[in-house]
Amino acid sequence: FAPVPRLTWEHGEVGLVQFHKPGIFNYSALLMSEDKDTLYVGAREAVFAVNALNISEKQHEVYWKVSEDKKSKCAEKGKSKQTECLNYIRVLQPLSSTSLYVCGTNAFQPTCDHLNLTSFKFLGKSEDGKGRCPFDPAHSYTSVMVGGELYSGTSYNFLGSEPIISRNSSHSPLRTEYAIPWLNEPSFVFADVIQKSPDGPEGEDDKVYFFFTEVSVEYEFVFKLMIPRVARVCKGDQGGLRTLQKKWTSFLKARLICSKPDSGLVFNILQDVFVLRAPGLKEPVFYAVFTPQLNNVGLSAVCAYTLATVEAVFSRGKYMQSATVEQSHTKWVRYNGPVPTPRPGACIDSEARAANYTSSLNLPDKTLQFVKDHPLMDDSVTPIDNRPKLIKKDVNYTQIVVDRTQALDGTFYDVMFISTDRGALHKAVILTKEVHVIEETQLFRDSEPVLTLLLSSKKGRKFVYAGSNSGVVQAPLAFCEKHGSCEDCVLARDPYCAWSPAIKACVTLHQEEASSRGWIQDMSGDTSSCLDKSKESFNQHFFKHGGTAELKCFQKSNLARVVWKFQNGELKAASPKYGFVGRKHLLIFNLSDGDSGVYQCLSEERVRNKTVSQLLAKHVLEVK
């Protein structure tokens, strides 16, 4: 299990910027416009534009309320007029440089509209949002805009019983079959497009990946066994001519594995996914947050998957097929029969074109019938190193974003920002042999779940934005200035931070910073370069005989142990003479002349089997 976060920042301790509007709730849709330095926020019955550099500065707002008539009709169907029968913004996607595509639940009558960014007004198009946005604000959803077409995963009907992955397109709309083997009570988590690799084979297609958790069809248990999935469709899909007409011909899905090797610990509920794309990476990496299905202990894990691993399952893996054996417990088994050509579920690539299959519309019926009946792959997608990057106890992770940053020595590190269901943000760096949880920041005053996380990755200014029911919080990627000494700065093992001996401060590293000469940073936590020992100041105290003295010591690191020394000997709390307050401050009882002298408070922190010792406080005590 990962260690506790080294540092804990309370809500008011660090520089967080907040945005919320009284009476507005459910700030669950965030969209960044890097070029405009604007963050768009979709909430209940409202959309806001705020300054991305300081989100407390509101630029625009527009309200999208439900009429009383609609509310009443919704309430007649058994829904709550005060909560469910409102308009929850669920889709907030860029349409052009001057407009956004926005969809809301609209009192169980999902509706979409275009938001003009110049006037910040809706155009009043009121398109049917069915299949693009859920009816029920409690139902899962995901969407991504690809080339002006919305790809969505949501529920298609009022009851929420009909799942759908669709492409909303004027010339070639597509959807999944409404069939249990295709989607079985899915909970949609994330969708994104992966563009064809520039060095990949000619004529490749862009692909859209959907991540969700669904009820297993391949295993039967006494309870509903949930399975995390990745599904994939091709951007160039146009459906079939007869079989799979206006349906995906490229829809395939596979199981995501995230488990601790040689243990029964299986993480099968997908919470969130982030696609890491970075100049130094040869291919995108999917980072995913999981929790176990029976999570009575509060466990969470992060697994990472390479695009190549995912692609290999879809392009070369075996398929599963429904077993019609009566009383069979494994209803789905590996299909070992002949696979039609072209390969079912494959995108139309140069190979297919060479065989005269220029579009999915002229794929042979055998291929289409096969993919219709075999949407599930037998092979599973395994994580990098076949194990989670991080397993954390006593926490329920909700969302993740990942930044790849360069340390002072030129090494690249993946830094994960993972939110919790109690309003906190954990920041963890992936080191060679371990994951170091740098810090935990309480983003929200109340312990409320973080609903959405967004990373702004503009060079020179990077922020994490978190949305919850009550508002949005903007946090810098690091609080370097909070590390008061060189040792603290280095022990943080934060790739964004380095100690500047010139100004005797822990500073934020900017990739384009030129004047970083002489700065100190060591990702192994080696503080031996910290030469400028801070000037030793001390506190002088005078106490009366027989009294009790309390000597303060402030230690921030959760990984360090506080040690008190008197006349160079370590003081133990077991003695009736001494007591500790909060494992930090020292109490000395029944004072006598022998208690006069110098008391030192030190912090001892083990980093990579080495103990780093720091003097935190020095007290000179005189008993009169």
């Epitope: 249990i180 009570e185 209803k331 219709k372």
Partner: antibody, heavy 118, light 111 residues
Framework: QVQLVQSGAEVKKPGSSVKVSCKAS????????MHWVRQAPGQGLEWMGQ????????SYNQKFKGKATITVDKSTSTAYMELSSLRSEDTAVYYC???????????WGQGTTVTVSS | DIVMTQSPDSLAVSLGERATINCKAS??????????MNWYQQKPGQPPKLLIY???NLESGVPDRFSGSGSGTDFTLTISSLQAEDVAVYYC?????????FGQGTKLEIK
Amino acid sequence: QVQLVQSGAEVKKPGSSVKVSCKASGYSFSDYYMHWVRQAPGQGLEWMGQINPTTGGASYNQKFKGKATITVDKSTSTAYMELSSLRSEDTAVYYCARYYYGRHFDVWGQGTTVTVSS
Amino acid sequence: DIVMTQSPDSLAVSLGERATINCKASQSVDYDGDSYMNWYQQKPGQPPKLLIYAASNLESGVPDRFSGSGSGTDFTLTISSLQAEDVAVYYCQQSNEDPYTFGQGTKLEIK
């Protein structure tokens, strides 16, 4: 071949309950949603609700919420519909029907007549 | 709920003649170019039988004298040449939006 065989006719007293069964054969039971439709004497067809046999997740027409309970037993490939607090207006023929990919009822049970009379 | 209204309520057509039944939905039953409208035939003492799905697709095993057309809110079932065995009640049904609803039925008889 694909078949849905329903239980026999029932005569029930007002206030009582009845459980109608629908046994599927000739196809993979868990791969298709099962729906229930009712037809009152001399009347048209009314959709009551559906069930996902894999998960047991049922959803109902608002009109029949609290009246009908749909369940499945995967081990016997059987769907059930229980009607509670029976009244004379519940007298009808009840059909189970398989919901196919194209969003239509392609196979129907033969129907079960439930008569509610004192 | 979407209300389906069939016309006429009953229809008498001579053998070999064309029979046309209309169905009007209170709101569109289309989604992204697909019409979720189905037609069923029910004979006395029997369950309904699927004839046409998705407005115009003929169910396998159904004679090709049956055809369906229409989109949006207006749909038609046509029997090109009525046969004696076609005497039955015909129902339209939408599956675009729950609750799924049926028309009141059209009784087709021989003139």
